[in-house]
């Protein structure tokens, strides 16, 4: 008996071939001997089966001695043995219809679990193997689960169902809802305008929800909500914003915040959360602000940074085009009695400059100038 695997919702062609390459009488029946379809001369005739409106054949193939049964919009319950009667012989085809669905939404938050459920006909014993977009293989029976979804799990999952040495392939598109970056860091000189961007790693037609940016300033004992906002069909509207600092927010995606100026009291780290409509849980992105200030007071030239810096970062003070006068893995460095000229304060990581502030030291009788 020939075995054919089909997918729920798909169309399948069950073939039946006669030895004579011409149009002759044929009938397709199910295992209960109920007629599905056949022919009367050139006419297609249909029986009283439950497939009536979903069964078809191809007249053009009859002249070649082929008498297919085409079943559209397959259902699991269409799984059956189908019998083609032609030329006083019977051809049997066993059709097994499978369905594979994500039993939650296919749009899932980062960190959530994905469960795939296989629908199969009674008496079948299929095995399933799925391959994620990043090439990870998972195997299972009727259900497959993947916990802690990551951004790289977004895309097409290809699942192969095996039964009777035959296979059928399912493709399921999964969207992991997350920000493009889990964390970002912005380095600014005191007084500069600060731009925070929170690009999403997915696109959907309609995006609705609400969000908030909580900020923990390095100098503050507790965190504080800087801004709350709503998102409706990708349009952003501010609900509430603190007076200090007075953040501004872009009206369109990607989420974009502007801090008028970087000040030491704002240096620290923030957590932007976004709660999406009809989703449990929230999207998170951490953002850090490091602020640099270079000052000269009397005979002391000082460079300081505030905010979350890694211990391996180097803070240096150097006279332009000269070797660094001072270089330390600390958050403040100074030079006593600096010579006149343009001094540079540099924050660097393994030789790569992250932040730079210049200060002009005038001869001792005049006051310093900051460009």
């Amino acid at each position: 008996k020939k075995v054919v695997l089909g997918k729920k919702g798909d169309t399948v062609e069950l073939t039946c071939t006669a030895s004579q390459k011409k149009s002759i009488q044929f009938h397709w029946k199910n295992s209960n001997q109920i007629k599905i379809l056949g022919n009367q001369g050139s006419f297609l005739t249909k029986g009283p089966s439950k497939l009536n409106d979903r069964a078809d054949s191809r007249r053009s193939l009859w002249d070649q001695g082929n008498f297919p049964l085409i079943i559209k919009n397959l259902k699991i319950e269409d799984s059956d043995t189908y019998i083609c009667e032609v030329e006083d012989q019977k051809e049997e085809v066993q059709l097994l219809v499978f369905g594979l669905t994500a039993n939650s939404d296919t749009h899932l938050l980062q960190g959530q679990s994905l469960t795939l459920t296989l629908e199969s006909p009674p008496g079948s014993s299929p095995s399933v193997q799925c391959r994620s977009p990043r090439g990870k293989n998972i195997q299972g029976g009727k259900t497959l689960s993947v916990s802690q979804l990551e951004l790289q799990d977004s895309g097409t999952w290809t699942c192969t169902v095996l039964q009777n040495q035959k296979k059928v392939e399912f493709k399921i598109d999964i969207v992991v809802l997350a920000f493009q970056k889990a964390s970002s860091i912005v380095y600014k000189k005191e007084g500069e305008q600060v731009e925070f961007s929170f690009p999403l790693a997915f696109t959907v037609e309609k995006l609705t929800g609400s969000g908030e940016l909580w900020w923990q300033a390095e100098r503050a004992s507790s965190s504080k909500s800087w801004i709350t906002f709503d998102l409706k069909n990708k349009e952003v509207s501010v609900k509430r914003v603190t007076q200090d600092p007075k953040l501004q927010m872009g009206k369109k995606l990607p989420l974009h915040l502007t801090l008028p100026q970087a000040l030491p009291q704002y240096a620290g780290s923030g957590n932007l959360t976004l709660a999406l409509e009809a989703k449990t849980g929230k999207l998170h992105q951490e953002v850090n602000l490091v602020v640099m200030r270079a000052t000269q007071l009397q005979k002391n030239l000082t460079c300081e940074v505030w905010g979350p810096t890694s211990p391996k970062l180097m803070l240096s003070l150097k006279l332009e085009n000269k070797e660094a006068k001072v270089s330390k893995r600390e958050k403040a460095v100074w030079v006593l009695n600096p010579e006149a000229g343009m001094w540079q304060c540099l924050l660097s990581d393994s030789g790569q400059v992250l932040l730079e502030s210049n200060i002009k030291v005038l001869p001792t009788w005049s006051t310093p100038v900051q460009p």
């Epitope: 089909g6 997918k7 919702g9 798909d10 169309t11 399948v12 062609e13 001369g41 050139s42 006419f43 297609l44 078809d56 191809r58 007249r59 053009s60 002249d63 085409i70 079943i71 559209k72």
Partner: antibody, heavy 115, light 107 residues
Framework: QVQLQQWGAGLLKPSETLSLTCAVY????????WSWIRQPPGKGLEWIGE???????NYNPSLKSRVTISVDTSKNQFSLKLSSVTAADTAVYYC?????????WGQGTLVTGGG | DIQMTQSPSSVSASVGDRVTITCRAS??????LAWYQHKPGKAPKLLIY???SLQSGVPSRFSGSGSGTDFTLTISSLQPEDFATYYC?????????FGQGTKLEIK
Amino acid sequence: QVQLQQWGAGLLKPSETLSLTCAVYGGSFSGYYWSWIRQPPGKGLEWIGEINHSGSTNYNPSLKSRVTISVDTSKNQFSLKLSSVTAADTAVYYCARVINWFDPWGQGTLVTGGG
Amino acid sequence: DIQMTQSPSSVSASVGDRVTITCRASQDISSWLAWYQHKPGKAPKLLIYAASSLQSGVPSRFSGSGSGTDFTLTISSLQPEDFATYYCQQANSFPYTFGQGTKLEIK
């Protein structure tokens, strides 16, 4: 909702090979036959040939010697190659899904043959 | 090959008119016939299949009849969007063939 999207070179010199591809989105690929049909300027529709997911083909005898239709089930795509084109092959070429009737159709590609 | 002959090759009519287009097959094709509507720059659209079955989403003013060799497409009350070229197609045997088309124009 099944959609067919087709593409390929639109301008050919005499004796070159016409090459078109049609991608099937949002529906079953197996169980159906996938056809190519053309319409020369100011004329009627002409069926070129068809293929199913397993590669079984049927061609119009008038074009059979020059036509090859192939299938790539991994991409849900099928392709048409028509060799040794002439000015008489200038037409809008359509791909379509078929059991007995053509539905739906691709958007059409105007191919200008040489000469 | 089965030849399909449509008549008339063009017809002028007004909105609200009843229009009938005929299609004749060169041999018996029982009910293996479809009708399509084709507008310039667009893909043809299936209207009627199996001679008389209305395709899903097609307005009920379109109807088909006939069997064997003679078939008709009727538009009961012409609407402005119905002005197009109409083709019949036989699915009885390879190669599939179409009628030469009937152009329906505004009077």
